[in-house]
Amino acid sequence: SERCDDWGLDTMRQIQVFEDEPARIKCPLFEHFLKFNYSTAHSAGLTLIWYWTRQDRDLEEPINFRLPENRISKEKDVLWFRPTLLNDTGNYTCMLRNTTYCSKVAFPLEVVQKDSCFNSPMKLPVHKLYIEYGIQRITCPNVDGYFPSSVKPTITWYMGCYKIQNFNNVIPEGMNLSFLIALISNNGNYTCVVTYPENGRTFHLTRTLTVKVVGSPKNAVPPVIHSPNDHVVYEKEPGEELLIPCTVYFSFLMDSRNEVWWTIDGKKPDDITIDVTINESISHSRTEDETRTQILSIKKVTSEDLKRSYVCHARSAKGEVAKAAKVKQKVPAPRYTVELACGFGAT
């Protein structure tokens, strides 16, 4: 009845688990909201209480910890399902309290079905491998804490639907999967199935991740400006539309921010009075190298605009480059009746 610090529904932690598999879910309070851990809270006499709201219901209800074979149990700050059922889907709340203190947070738990090829609505983590690197490994994720170190599970790896056996450059090594000299054909979904015994029962953990082979840092170069270049001159008459594309190639670099921008007479377009618009498009190669194009457009260019300096700039973690566009005013073709006649001495 007393006030409780309610952190609301933590949708950032959209937890998805597979049906008919064990799941261990830590109370998010200690990981993301409170400055102390469960042991400290427990020592201080605080109690952790769990309850839930079923999918499409409003009613909060206690979790039944008296199910056959302890299907749902709590251990310290962890809620255990051994295993999950489809109708365990809902919003779960963990509340830490005593007579003077109360804090709680809710989080959504979705129990997901998978088919025989491990396809499911599960959001998959992406692991990037560098093309042509010698040896790179992925590790079966999120299996810590399910079984003690004395238990030796069996691990089977799959690519898509196929068990990985005698794959030329993909080698299962227990919890790890090694890739030798990765190629783009190694792109795909990889699944590890971990099987372990517990109290006379056998449990399976299924973990799928997406492997994406990307450009290698050894091949990375500073940004390359393909346009503007020295071969193209933007020759316009006043009143015409001026369109200058700035096209830049960026090597893939992990966590690099790629930037392209124009300056006009050394200033950003926003900082000058002329009516200029800039449209950007981005495309990616199969190894996630990036090509950015920014088209600078002046609808009705003036003779003053044609005297300005238009410079395309690009920056990545590999360096910064710039290139000026060649812009000039078109010399109008002579009108015979006036210019040429005058030239011939006509009056």
Partner: antibody, heavy 118, light 107 residues
Amino acid sequence: EVQLLESGGGLVQPGGSLRLSCAASGFTFSQFGMTWVRQAPGKGLEWVSAISYDGEGTLYADSVKGRFTISRDNSKNTLYLQMNSLRAEDTAVYYCARFRYYTAFDYWGQGTLVTVSS
Amino acid sequence: EIVMTQSPATLSVSPGERATLSCRASQSVSSNLAWYQQKPGQAPRLLIYGASTRATGIPARFSGSGSGTEFTLTISSLQSEDFAVYYCQQYNNWPWTFGQGTKVEIK
């Protein structure tokens, strides 16, 4: 100019061993994967083995797995192929080649002949 | 292992004529296909990579096309130095595999 020069070929008895070398010049050797390809007399090309630029990743054709070992010394710009338990069917010209995923085997050596015969 | 099949095994062509060589992969190799030329007693030379991109220094009369499983090498007007054996190779999946070769001979 990119150059690859193989050496170490010769006549060897079945069950014997041979070590081929490939000396590279004209490019940054440590930046490229390298490979061995062989060609039996009057036959087509067969990929034998590949090694990553850093020497950590190695791959082999099934026909040589467990018998051949590819290695490299980036400080010496040299690629090696250690061939053990040689068989008559390993008789071939052995070429080393530079590879990149984007451009396949873009430069080749002139080859060295290995003859396995009693 | 991806099997590469070239046809025909031998192609007899007169100098100045067009030659069309085919290569088929047992499964898709995307556009990760190369063509090599080999003359007697010499090492192979890269002609085409990425199914259609000419390697450095290769004359424009050589062109490649195709993607997936069907590929073609075309020599628009055969010169005397073009009579050789041509191999296709996939580098999409390990092991990288070659076709058995097409011999282009003088008719």
